[in-house]
Amino acid sequence: LPAQVAFTPYAPEPGGTCRLREYYDQTAQMCCSKCPPGQHAKVFCTKTSDTVCDSCEDSTYTQLWNWVPECLSCGSRCSSDQVETQACTREQNRICTCRPGWYCALTKQEGCRLCAPLRKCRPGFGVARPGTETSDVVCKPCAPGTFSNTTSSTDICRPHQICNVVAVPGNASMDAVCTSTSPTRSMAPGPVHLPQPVSTRSQHTQPTPAPSTAPGTSFLLPVGPSPPAEGSTGD
């Protein structure tokens, strides 16, 4: 004879476990039904009645089979620096990612908590390390014999053109000017771009030039306290 199928709630065999999509309720001491994603436990089970589930309210969600009394609050609305790549629904939290030209300065479990614009290296400085989805551009002063005349998050320092006769010597922010009609160059002319996983920073974050200071000694900082807890007010 086929084994009899137990309907929830039921008492498990001694030492046994509840089935998939069921949980053991300590109070009732029974195996009871979990609620599906998008729902939560409105009334917990008893020895004689199963779990009563209800839909998540607006701006709340459950992603897994569960028996939580309240759904989880969706995260804060995405800021203007971000793009909502996954909307808040009853079954999933919203996910915010950085828009092109920005990087994630503060990550969270899914998506990004704070986006910041990729740094643009000003004339006289070139990109030492390109930005990524989670790290900013690193700029370095152009070494003697190289220059950068752009404000860019992708251009590196490139060599001065080599002149037969120099009209104006090059510096960190300007190429050499030749009197000869056929200068030679160790690299192809034009700005040199580093490969970049994220596009260049939008124009609105152009740095305000200021007097250059010599780079100081960098200090490695231990990770400090977290920023204010994320708002859970949702929409």
Epitope: A105, S135, D136, C139, P209, P211, P215, T217, S218
Partner: nanobody, 124 residues
């Protein structure tokens, strides 16, 4: 103990001004990029401004450009945000952060030290 402490927030009328301070202790601010961000009520954190330590360059979000000024006093180990012509949409929790420029192999580039924030409310 490494920490940042913000102060200077409060209630101000539209058109008014506030100067926020972010004081560092336990480390030297001079070798770090400084960033201010804010969290409006019910919204996510949004970037406002960054001051790069190596060149003293300053960048600003469109929404605050021409009204806010970021600055630093190395002797006082403090970064400031001067906020002028404040608007109701500037309301929020303002936090500052210090990060070593570009990170390193030992500590990847990410905001390393955060303050707890200071509340700014702009209302008539």
């Amino acid at each position: 103990d490494v920490q940042l402490v913000e102060s200077g927030g409060g209630l101000v009328h539209p058109g008014g001004s506030l100067r926020l301070s972010c004081a560092a202790s336990g480390f030297t601010f001079s070798a770090d990029d400084a960033t201010w961000a804010r969290q409006p009520p019910g919204k996510g954190l949004e970037w406002i401004s960054t001051l790069y330590f190596d060149t003293e360059e300053k960048t600003y979000a469109d929404s605050v450009k021409g009204r806010f000024i970021i600055s630093r006093d190395i002797a006082k180990n403090t970064v400031y945000l001067q906020m002028n012509n404040l608007k109701p949409e500037d309301t929020g929790m303002y936090v500052c952060t210090a990060t070593w420029a570009g990170g390193s192999l030992l500590r990847p580039a990410s905001f390393g030290v955060w303050g707890q924030g200071t509340q700014v409310t702009v209302s008539s």
